[in-house]
C-alpha cells in the first residue's frame, strides 16, 4: 500500500499525490475506496508506478521522498499519458505556414524580450522541420500565446506561483494550438524565475502535436529545468518526435517556393495556387505573393499578400469574384475571407462549411463564379460543387466529377477564373486551358504564365 501511517503530513502528501496523479496520470479518485487513509486495491499504487516509470524514478509504488519531490517540481499542465489522442489522422497542422499572435504581454519582461523569446522558441522547431512561423498582430492566428492567471477561459485553471507553469492545446481550430503561460510565475530571459524561452519551446511542441517525453534530456519532458539558453538544443527524442509528424527541413523542397524567395514569373514550371479577376485586373496567387495583371496590358507587378491585406494568410488556395457586388472570396484550408471593395470584411475568416460542404471537405482547390447563371463552382479533388449565390445554398445533385462535365479538364485543378463572358481559364500545374463553357470544350492550351508575355 502507498502509505500506512496517518500522520497529518502524510495525509497531506497522500491528498497531494492523489491530485497530481488525477491531473497528470488519469487516476480516477472516485474509484478509490478510502478507510482511514488506507487504500484497498492497487489503483493508487499502479498510478504511482506509472508516474515513476514515466519520469525515470525508481519504481516502488510508494509516495517516497524522490516521488514527492518530483510531484512538487514546477511543470507543464498537460497530462503525461493518454493526452494527444486527437482527431482521426492525428493532431498535426495540415500546412507548412503557421501564424502565431501574442495576445498580451507579461509585465515581468520587456515586450521586445517576450517577442524575441517566443520567436526564438518557434525557430527551434522550424530549424528541424519544413514548418515556417510568422507573427501577426491582428486577426485570427493559428497559435495564440496568452499570459493569464487562475481561471482563464478553459477547463484548466492555473494554480498560482509554482506548480503548473503553462499548458498548450494540440493543433486544431479554436483553442487548438494555443499556448497559455501562468502570469503568477515570474517570467525571465535568464536562469532566475522561469525562463520564458525554454517554457515556450516546450509548449510550442504541444501546439505542434507532441505529447510529453519520458526522456529527461528532452525539452518535452514534463518538468521544468533551466539549461543554458545559449547552448540549448533539442534532444534526439524531440527531433524524432517532431519529424515523425512533419518530416525534416528538406521536405521544404517539396513546397514550390521556400519562405522568402519570390517565384520566377517566367519559370516554365510555374504553377499558381489561385487566380481570380478583381474588376479589370487579374490576381495570380502563389505562396506569400500575388501578381497583378491589368487586362490587355503587358505590365505586371508582384506584391506580398500581407502588404495589401495584412490580416490574410499566405498560401491562398482558391479565389473568386462577384463583380456586381464588388466582392472577392479567398479560401485557405477550411476557412474563407470576404474582401469588399478591396477591404477585408470584419468577422472573417468563416468556415467553408457555411456554404454547405460536407464535413469531409477540408479545403477548396479552386473556385469560379459565373455571372450568367449566378452560380459559383467549387473544385475539390476530382469533384466539383455548384453553389447558388442568390439562394445561398448548394444546388442539388452535387458533387459531380470534373472529368465528366468539363471535357478534357481534370481530374484535379489548381486554379480557375472566368473572363470575356464565355471562357473559364483552368490551371493545372504549369499548364492552362481556355475552356468555352457554351461550347463545353477546350479552345486553347497555354502555359500557366502566358498572361505575362513569357
Amino acid at each position: 500500500l502507498p502509505l500506512n501511517s496517518s500522520t497529518s503530513l502524510e495525509k497531506n502528501n497522500v491528498l497531494f499525490g492523489e491530485r497530481y496523479l488525477e491531473k497528470f496520470y488519469g487516476l480516477e479518485i472516485n474509484k478509490l475506496p478510502v478507510t482511514k487513509m488506507k487504500y484497498s486495491g492497487n489503483l493508487m499504487k499502479e498510478k504511482i508506478q506509472e508516474m515513476q516509470h514515466f519520469l525515470g524514478l525508481k519504481v516502488t509504488g510508494q509516495l517516497d521522498t524522490s516521488t514527492l519531490e518530483m510531484m512538487h517540481a514546477p511543470r507543464c499542465g498537460v497530462p503525461d499519458v493518454h493526452h494527444f489522442r486527437e482527431m482521426p489522422g492525428g493532431p498535426v497542422w495540415r500546412k507548412h505556414y503557421i501564424t502565431y499572435r501574442i495576445n498580451n504581454y507579461t509585465p515581468d519582461m520587456n515586450r521586445e524580450d517576450v517577442d524575441y523569446a517566443i520567436r526564438k522558441a518557434f525557430q527551434v522547431w522550424s530549424n528541424v522541420t519544413p514548418l515556417k512561423f510568422s507573427k501577426i498582430n491582428t486577426g485570427m492566428a493559428d497559435i495564440l500565446v496568452v499570459f493569464a492567471r487562475g481561471a482563464h477561459g478553459d477547463f484548466h485553471a492555473f494554480d498560482g506561483k509554482g506548480g503548473i507553469l503553462a499548458h498548450a492545446f494540440g493543433p486544431g481550430s479554436g483553442i487548438g494550438g494555443d499556448a497559455h503561460f501562468d502570469e503568477d510565475e515570474f517570467w525571465t530571459t535568464h536562469s532566475g524565475g522561469t525562463n520564458l524561452f525554454l517554457t515556450a519551446v516546450h509548449e510550442i511542441g504541444h501546439s505542434l502535436g507532441l505529447g510529453h517525453s519520458s526522456d529527461p534530456k528532452a525539452v518535452m519532458f514534463p518538468t521544468y529545468k533551466y539549461v543554458d539558453i545559449n547552448t540549448f538544443r533539442l534532444s534526439a527524442d524531440d527531433i524524432r518526435g517532431i519529424q515523425s509528424l512533419y518530416g525534416d527541413p528538406k521536405e521544404n523542397q517539396r513546397l514550390p517556393n521556400p519562405d522568402n524567395s519570390e517565384p520566377a514569373l517566367c519559370d516554365p514550371n510555374l504553377s499558381f495556387d489561385a487566380v481570380t479577376t478583381v474588376g479589370n485586373k487579374i490576381f495570380f496567387f502563389k505562396d506569400r505573393f500575388f501578381w497583378l495583371k491589368v487586362s490587355e496590358r503587358p505590365k505586371t507587378s508582384v506584391n506580398l499578400i500581407s502588404s495589401l491585406w495584412p490580416t490574410l494568410p499566405s498560401g491562398i488556395e482558391a479565389a473568386y469574384e462577384i463583380e456586381a457586388r464588388n466582392q472577392v472570396f479567398l479560401f485557405k484550408d477550411d476557412k474563407y475571407w470576404l474582401i469588399s471593395n478591396l477591404r477585408p470584411e470584419p468577422n472573417y475568416p468563416k468556415s467553408i462549411h457555411s456554404f454547405g460542404f460536407p464535413n469531409f471537405v477540408k479545403k477548396i482547390d479552386a473556385a469560379v463564379f459565373n455571372p450568367r447563371f449566378y452560380r459559383t463552382y467549387f473544385f475539390v479533388d476530382n469533384q466539383y460543387w455548384r453553389y447558388d449565390e442568390r439562394r445561398q445554398m448548394m444546388d442539388p445533385g452535387y458533387p459531380k466529377l470534373i472529368t465528366k462535365n468539363f471535357q478534357g479538364i481534370g481530374p484535379k485543378i489548381d486554379a480557375v477564373f472566368y473572363s470575356k463572358n464565355k471562357y473559364y481559364y483552368f490551371f493545372q500545374g504549369s499548364n492552362q486551358f481556355e475552356y468555352d463553357f457554351l461550347l463545353q470544350r477546350i479552345t486553347k492550351t497555354l502555359k500557366s504564365n502566358s498572361w505575362f508575355g513569357c
Epitope: 488519469g26 482521426p88 485570427m140 486544431g172
Partner: antibody, heavy 122, light 103 residues
Framework: EVQLLESGGGLVQPGGSLRLSCAAS????????MHWVRQAPGKGLEWVSY????????HYADSVKGRFTISRDNSKNTLYLQMNSLRAEDTAVYYC???????????????WGRGTLVTVSS | DIQMTQSPSSLSASVGDRVTITCRAN??????LNWYQQKPGKAPELLIY???SLQSGVPSRFSGSGSGTDFTLTISSLQPEDFATYYC?????FGQGTKLEIK
C-alpha cells in the same frame, strides 16, 4: 452520423440515487472527451461534468462535486453519470455532449443527445 | 471565477430583421467563446465557435465577433426557423440565454 442517446432518467426521492447512460455511435468514442450538461425546467444550460478519452481526467461543477461521478466504458461506447444524494435542485433534463477535441478539453460541444429527464421529488 | 452575462434576456423581432445578441465576460476569455441555438423541446446546437468561426452546416446569415470580454452574435436577416433561445458559452460556463421571439 453521430448519435447520442441518453437513458436512465426518472422520478427519484431526495437523497436517492440514479445512474444515467449515454450510448454513442457514428464516431470513434474512445478518441473524444465527453460531457454532461443539464437544464432545469424553464431555465438555462448548466455544465455538469466531463471525462477524458481514456476515462481519467474528470472534472465537475462545484454544485455536483462529491455527489456525482462521471465514467465511461469505451468497449461499450457508453458514457455514465452516477448521481447520489440527489436534491430537488438537481431536477433537470440531462444531456450528454461530445467535445470537438480529443485531448485537454476546450468545452466545445459539437453534438448533443436529446436528453433524459430527472425529477427529484418526494 | 469567470461569469458570462448575456443581453438582452429576450428580444422580439420580425422576419428579415437584423438581430444582435451580446455576451460579456467579467474577465478576458480571448476568443474562447461559443454560441448555441436551442429550440423548444430540442437539444442545443452549436452555431459559432472561437467567437467567429461558423460551425459546419450553419447558414452564413449567422456571424459572431469579439474578443477579450465583449462578444456579439448577429443574424443578418431573420428567417422563421431562427426564432429560438441562444446561449453563449465558454468552457463550463453558459450565459443565461436570450429568447428570440416573433414580433
Amino acid at each position: 452520423e453521430v448519435q447520442l442517446l441518453e437513458s436512465g432518467g426518472g422520478l427519484v426521492q431526495p437523497g436517492g440515487s440514479l445512474r444515467l447512460s449515454c450510448a454513442a455511435s457514428g464516431f470513434t468514442f474512445s478518441d473524444y472527451n465527453m460531457h454532461w450538461v443539464r437544464q432545469a425546467p424553464g431555465k438555462g444550460l448548466e455544465w455538469v461534468s466531463y471525462i477524458g478519452p481514456s476515462g481519467g481526467y474528470t472534472h465537475y461543477a462545484d454544485s455536483v462535486k462529491g455527489r456525482f461521478t462521471i465514467s465511461r466504458d469505451n468497449s461499450k461506447n457508453t458514457l455514465y453519470l452516477q448521481m447520489n444524494s440527489l436534491r430537488a435542485e438537481d431536477t433537470a433534463v440531462y444531456y450528454c455532449a461530445k467535445d470537438i477535441r480529443g485531448a485537454y478539453s476546450s468545452g466545445l460541444f459539437d453534438y448533443w443527445g436529446r436528453g433524459t429527464l430527472v425529477t427529484v421529488s418526494s | 471565477d469567470i461569469q458570462m452575462t448575456q443581453s438582452p434576456s429576450s428580444l422580439s423581432a420580425s422576419v428579415g430583421d437584423r438581430v444582435t445578441i451580446t455576451c460579456r465576460a467579467n474577465q478576458s476569455i480571448y476568443t474562447y467563446l461559443n454560441w448555441y441555438q436551442q429550440k423548444p423541446g430540442k437539444a442545443p446546437e452549436l452555431l459559432i465557435y472561437a467567437a467567429s468561426s461558423l460551425q459546419s452546416g450553419v447558414p452564413s446569415r449567422f456571424s459572431g465577433s469579439g474578443s477579450g470580454t465583449d462578444f456579439t452574435l448577429t443574424i443578418s436577416s431573420l428567417q422563421p426557423e431562427d426564432f429560438a433561445t441562444y446561449y453563449c458559452q465558454q468552457a463550463g460556463i453558459f450565459g443565461q440565454g436570450t429568447k428570440l421571439e416573433i414580433k
